[in-house]
């Protein structure tokens, strides 16, 4: 039994880090493998993560971490029984993938303005809370070419757009994702999408 693709890990900078790797053949990850992780430098306990299968030869492990600070560094040991298959380390602050925003809502009752709001996925005491920026994706269910991205570079989790920038009388969907420049994070996953019917009063044209 060998590791074909070494574990790579990302942290949500809150409570979970996710590590994925591939074995050289079909593996029952949960019965055959264990990933041990332990904080370096400070007094701490070695914790065991039981991996799950992620495709035939792929494994994924969710490492529980009650909090994260920038200095944290973990040793990672991948075991198959008594055999050490791989040894490495992981610094969560250098591999951050934020949590996806939630509760995306489209408010269509503000004159001819669309107000999109969503929730910051972090509590106020988490460092990322005040450092997230967002991308909002809006697309038409009828027209695949009608696909747009709005970058929200301010901290407030909301976006206002004129309803007239979208076609009237058709359905649109929106979703949002987040990233944090301070830690050069990857983008989060997209939030679940929300759907609305776009309609607005066409301006009266005088001839």
């Amino acid at each position: 039994m060998k590791v074909l693709q070494e574990p790579t890990c990302v942290s949500d900078y809150m409570s979970i880090s996710t590590c994925e790797w591939k074995m050289n053949g079909p593996t029952n990850c949960s019965t055959e493998l264990r990933l041990l992780y332990q904080l370096v430098f400070l007094l701490s306990e070695a914790h065991t993560c039981i991996p799950e299968n992620n495709g035939g030869a792929g494994c994924v492990c969710h490492l529980l971490m009650d909090d994260v600070v920038s200095a944290d560094n973990y040793t990672l040991d991948l075991w198959a029984g008594q055999q050490l298959l791989w040894k490495g380390s992981f610094k969560p602050s250098e591999h951050v993938k934020p949590r996806a925003p939630g509760n995306l809502t489209v408010h269509t009752n503000v004159s001819d303005t669309l107000l999109l709001t969503w929730s910051n996925p972090y509590p106020p005491d988490n460092y990322l809370y005040n450092h997230l920026t967002y991308a909002v994706n809006i697309w038409s269910e009828n027209d695949p070419a009608d696909f747009r991205i709005y970058n929200v570079t301010y901290l407030e989790p909301s976006l206002r757009i004129a309803a007239s920038t979208l076609k009237s009388g058709i359905s649109y969907r929106a979703r949002v994702r987040a990233w944090a420049q301070c830690y050069n994070t990857t983008w989060s996953e997209w939030s679940p999408s929300t759907k609305w019917h776009n309609s607005y009063r066409e301006p009266f044209e005088q001839h």
Epitope: L42, L43, E45, A46, D66, D67, V69, S70, A71
Partner: antibody
Framework: EVTLKESGPVLVKPTETLTLTCTVS????????VHWIRQPPGKALEWLGV???????DYNAAFKSRLTISKDNSKSQVVLTMTNMDPVDTATYYC????????????WGQGTTVTVSS | DIQMTQSPSSLSASVGDRVTITCRAS??????LAWYQQKPGKAPKLLIY???TLAEGVPSRFSGSGSGTDFTLTISSLQPEDFATYYC????????FGQGTKLEIK
């Protein structure tokens, strides 16, 4: 409600062995580590050692040769044994729960005062 | 072992005052520092960990800052129940505490 309570002798003679028990409730010893900390009268706190949720232990090097920490998960009890007691070991002894992955103490026992005297 | 030096060892203040207690580590401990409050005859109570994270149920008038070797605990507006002894603690092995700062009523 999370509680920890220390019990054991109030008075120990020099060279004797001290055995203290920490009985916990409101959480499982299979999920949390438990530390022992002591405080001599009028002095600062001093960390003695810890038994982790998995049963492994870490000790302050200054006490390692005469300190043993063990536990019985089913009884929710952690036991501290310190050999060759000396009058300088007179202190209030506390057990405390480890908070998550950080060795900080979010719940403490009320402490038990141990006097070492002949 | 890493030594923790607290200052001052004691201080007098009045209700409503802003108070700062400092803790210095003999070497870099990053942000691996906690603060505790202890009242006479009682067990210590966790106030802050990771240098600045407020423990559950601790009033927001308490705050912590610093990283590396220099740390501070600040009480923005002293309340009568805040008069106690305060300890810092780092969590590198072996764990050590500062010698304490006794906060008394002026």
């Amino acid at each position: 409600e999370v509680t920890l309570k220390e019990s054991g002798p109030v008075l120990v003679k020099p060279t004797e062995t001290l055995t203290l028990t920490c009985t916990v409730s409101g959480f499982s010893l299979t999920n949390y580590g438990v530390h022992w900390i002591r405080q001599p009268p009028g002095k600062a706190l001093e960390w003695l050692g810890v038994i982790w949720s998995g049963g492994s232990t870490d000790y302050n090097a200054a006490f390692k040769s005469r300190l043993t920490i063990s536990k019985d998960n089913s009884k929710s009890q952690v036991v501290l044994t310190m050999t060759n007691m000396d009058p300088v070991d007179t202190a209030t002894y506390y057990c405390a729960r480890n908070k998550g992955t950080r060795p900080v103490f979010d719940y403490w026992g009320q402490g038990t005062t141990v006097t070492v005297s002949s | 072992d890493i030594q923790m030096t607290q200052s001052p060892s004691s201080l007098s203040a009045s209700v409503g005052d802003r108070v700062t207690i400092t803790c210095r580590a003999s070497e870099n401990i990053y942000s691996y520092l906690a603060w505790y409050q202890q009242k006479p005859g009682k067990a210590p109570k966790l106030l802050i960990y990771n240098a600045k994270t407020l423990a559950e149920g601790v009033p927001s008038r308490f705050s912590g800052s610093g990283s590396g070797t220099d740390f501070t605990l600040t009480i923005s507006s002293l309340q009568p129940e805040d008069f106690a002894t305060y300890y810092c603690q780092h969590y590198v092995s072996p764990l050590t505490f500062g010698q304490g700062t006794k906060l008394e009523i002026k």
